[in-house]
Amino acid sequence: ITQQDLAPQQRAAPQQKRSSPSEGLCPPGHHISEDGRDCISCKYGQDYSTHWNDLLFCLRCTRCDSGEVELSPCTTTRNTVCQCEEGTFREEDSPEMCRKCRTGCPRGMVKVGDCTPWSDIECVHKESGTKHSGEVPAVEETVTSSPGTPASPCSLSG
């Protein structure tokens, strides 16, 4: 399909800044116009684009879920940055939700790592020093964990 095959129709929208594409691409914070002759700015706080692009539409800003805090708002060139609230973390396996950190380690294990927004508490066997697999134990000791200090945030896209 050729680019000429696209015949866009845009309904009236708020005034959006326009500039000209460079070699068919628009700068971050913009998307390409209907005829490919203009770059149209994304709508601040609503959508964004992060790279030079030939996108028909800007990407929708992420809205932080309940259980998340907004570290930085969405701009026309950067998506919202959300982070799990204290006492919860996001795993790579299930990035769509924050899970509660365990409050302590299983018997025979000691805590060597705090709960952070991107990891559960870390437990190792007292003797061997090997890490616990991460399953929630049936019985927990009263070794409690305080939430870790936020460091690098977790960013979710569109």
Epitope: I1, T2, Q3, D5, L6, P8, Q9, Q10, R11, A13, G24, H31, I32, G36, Q46, D47, N53, D54, L55, L56, F57, C58, L59, R60, T62, S157, G158
Partner: nanobody, 124 residues
Framework: EVQLLESGGGEVQPGGSLRLSCAAS????????MGWFRQAPGKDREFVSA????????YYAESVKGRFTISRDNAKNTLYLQMSSLRAEDTAVYYC?????????????????WGQGTLVTVKP
Amino acid sequence: EVQLLESGGGEVQPGGSLRLSCAASGRTVSNYAMGWFRQAPGKDREFVSALNWGGDTTYYAESVKGRFTISRDNAKNTLYLQMSSLRAEDTAVYYCAAAQSFRRGGAPYGDNYWGQGTLVTVKP
């Protein structure tokens, strides 16, 4: 994960109308741009129409402009394609797609999901 299921296809005479629907499940598609593509027998899949996440900007292939209308209902998680003045050359399997955006020319950008398609046949 998003699942898309098209419906509304069928056989119609030239000049007739059909309305295709695409129901999304598994996860809301309100964050995604959505589009319709089609594949005629023995041909490559081609872009038909797309609209942005808010539904306020639409694009159409030149071949369907003025005859087809794309729309979405985010509350129902559903995309529509109203097709009128149908021609024999509109005969194809029509696919629904959800993507973070679409590039000029129609290629999906970023995460994208596809339905299984619904057959539209236009013949006298």
